[in-house]
Interface confidence: medium
Amino acid sequence: MAVTACQGLGFVVSLIGIAGIIAATCMDQWSTQDLYNNPVTAVFNYQGLWRSCVRESSGFTECRGYFTLLGLPAMLQAVRALMIVGIVLGAIGLLVSIFALKCIRIGSMEDSAKANMTLTSGIMFIVSGLCAIAGVSVFANMLVTNFWMSTANMYTGMGGMVQTVQTRYTFGAALFVGWVAGGLTLIGGVMMCIACRGLAPEETNYKAVSYHASGHSVAYKPGGFKASTGFGSNTKNKKIYDGGARTEDEVQSYPSKHDYV
């Protein structure tokens, strides 16, 4: 029962996480115009992985896609790649985990097969979550690094669009969605891996016992019994993931002056 609950919860948490990663990837607000000290503006600028937008005070919003690939900063390309890899791995993980769910019976699928599939999907979710967290963190670090390396006359934007000093960008909602979603996917993956431990079959090697009944002889050999509950002696929960999250400011790498924001 506990295994089914852990597996089911892991699946649901991962599902929510992956939905969040997809949402974050599609969102336009990865970096938003910094409104601190400057709450009233005629236009509000924000940028995503795929396009940049301008919202006028009238409510009219105009977005322009980044129609160049070569002109975009390598860091932005890396973030796109990380998010897409995260989504793909997460989607495959979801597909695999559906068939691995204990509550769903597909033909005469062995518990060992379900355990392997659960572990596979768990690992996929963990990697997916890490990809999303890495992607979002790289982007955040890119924004902050750009600010720390900037001077008054060095403000250029995505794809070479020049910005004035007055347009400064800070963390957008998509970054926070991405961090939370990545974390949820990671947690879901860990739960799937824990559930896998409970699903794993344990060979209970009983000695063959012969029962001599009157009239005829029946030999009962229970050696093939599989313990499929999670309460076996070998169900210690191993720590699957012990990654310490670091803040964007602790990343002390100093990349070259890229032309983003």
């Epitope: 910094d34 601190y36 000290n37 400057n38 924004l143 902050v144 690094t145 600010f147 720390w148 900037s150 001077t151 008054a152 403000y155 004035t164 000093v165 007055q166 400064r168 800070t170 963390f171 803040t247 964007e248 400011d249 602790e250 990343v251 002390q252």
Partner: antibody, heavy 125, light 107 residues
Framework: QVQLVQSGAEVKKPGASVKVSCEAS????????MHWVRQAPGQGLEWMGI????????NYAQKFQGRVTMTRDTSTSTVYMELSSLRSEDTAVYYC??????????????????WGQGTTVTVSS | DIQMTQSPSSLSASVGDRVTITCRAS??????LGWYQQKPGKAPKRLIY???SLQSGVPSRFSGSGSGTEFTLTISSLQPEDFTTYYC?????????FGQGTELEIR
């Protein structure tokens, strides 16, 4: 309350280096930037640079590039400013000043709200 | 670099007077400006942040206004302790720059 306590006055010879310390207390050390500002006798204020105690990133004024090094020690909540190849024009009062920001709102500096008492550095042969 | 031009460089006034100090930025700095007061032999003290917000503990006779390139500090009714030096600081982009200062003296 928030306090910045700087090291004592220094007298140095031209060509030498000086290292001024600034110990912070009364707030979370890594949640604020630290600036260094100097003031030559009878002159105005001059911004030297900024350090982020969380991570150690720095940005220096072009004038001091290559001569100034700002570091921090999170275990003692102390920021250091080292100025090398001293010349007589470096005779000034050196101030550290806190710049409190909120990473969830914006990581941009918001200006110096609390200042140290100042450290007098005299460069004389 | 962004140049901050502060005017006047010195100003004579009497107790109770209303005075205005101006700071002009060489390019737009949004509202990323602070006003500081410095008494002889002391560290500067912030009076105004974000161009127009009063720092806590600062008397209400001090006020700031402006945005973009033009900023003003107004002292509505001068008190004896206000006769000292004032600086503006832009913290919009590196390198941060101060105005050259305004010395306020008793007439």
């Amino acid at each position: 309350q928030v306090q910045l306590v700087q090291s004592g006055a220094e007298v140095k010879k031209p060509g030498a280096s000086v290292k001024v310390s600034c110990e912070a207390s009364g707030y979370t050390f890594t949640s604020s930037y630290m600036h260094w500002v100097r003031q030559a006798p009878g002159q105005g204020l001059e911004w030297m640079g900024i350090i982020n105690p969380s991570g150690g990133r720095t940005n220096y004024a072009q004038k001091f590039q290559g001569r100034v090094t700002m570091t921090r020690d999170t275990s003692t909540s102390t920021v250091y400013m080292e100025l090398s190849s001293l010349r007589s024009e470096d005779t000034a009062v050196y101030y550290c000043a806190r710049d409190h920001y909120d990473i969830f709102t914006t990581y941009y500096p918001r200006g110096m709200d609390v200042w140290g008492q100042g450290t007098t550095v005299t460069v004389s042969s | 670099d962004i140049q901050m031009t502060q005017s006047p460089s010195s100003l004579s006034a009497s107790v109770g007077d209303r005075v205005t100090i101006t700071c002009r930025a060489s390019q737009g700095i949004r509202n990323d400006l602070g006003w500081y007061q410095q008494k002889p032999g002391k560290a500067p003290k912030r009076l105004i942040y974000a161009a127009s917000s009063l720092q806590s503990g600062v008397p209400s006779r001090f006020s700031g206004s402006g945005s973009g390139t033009e900023f003003t500090l107004t002292i509505s009714s001068l008190q004896p302790e206000d006769f000292t030096t004032y600086y503006c600081l832009q913290h919009n982009s590196f390198p941060f720059t101060f105005g050259q200062g305004t010395e306020l003296e008793i007439r």
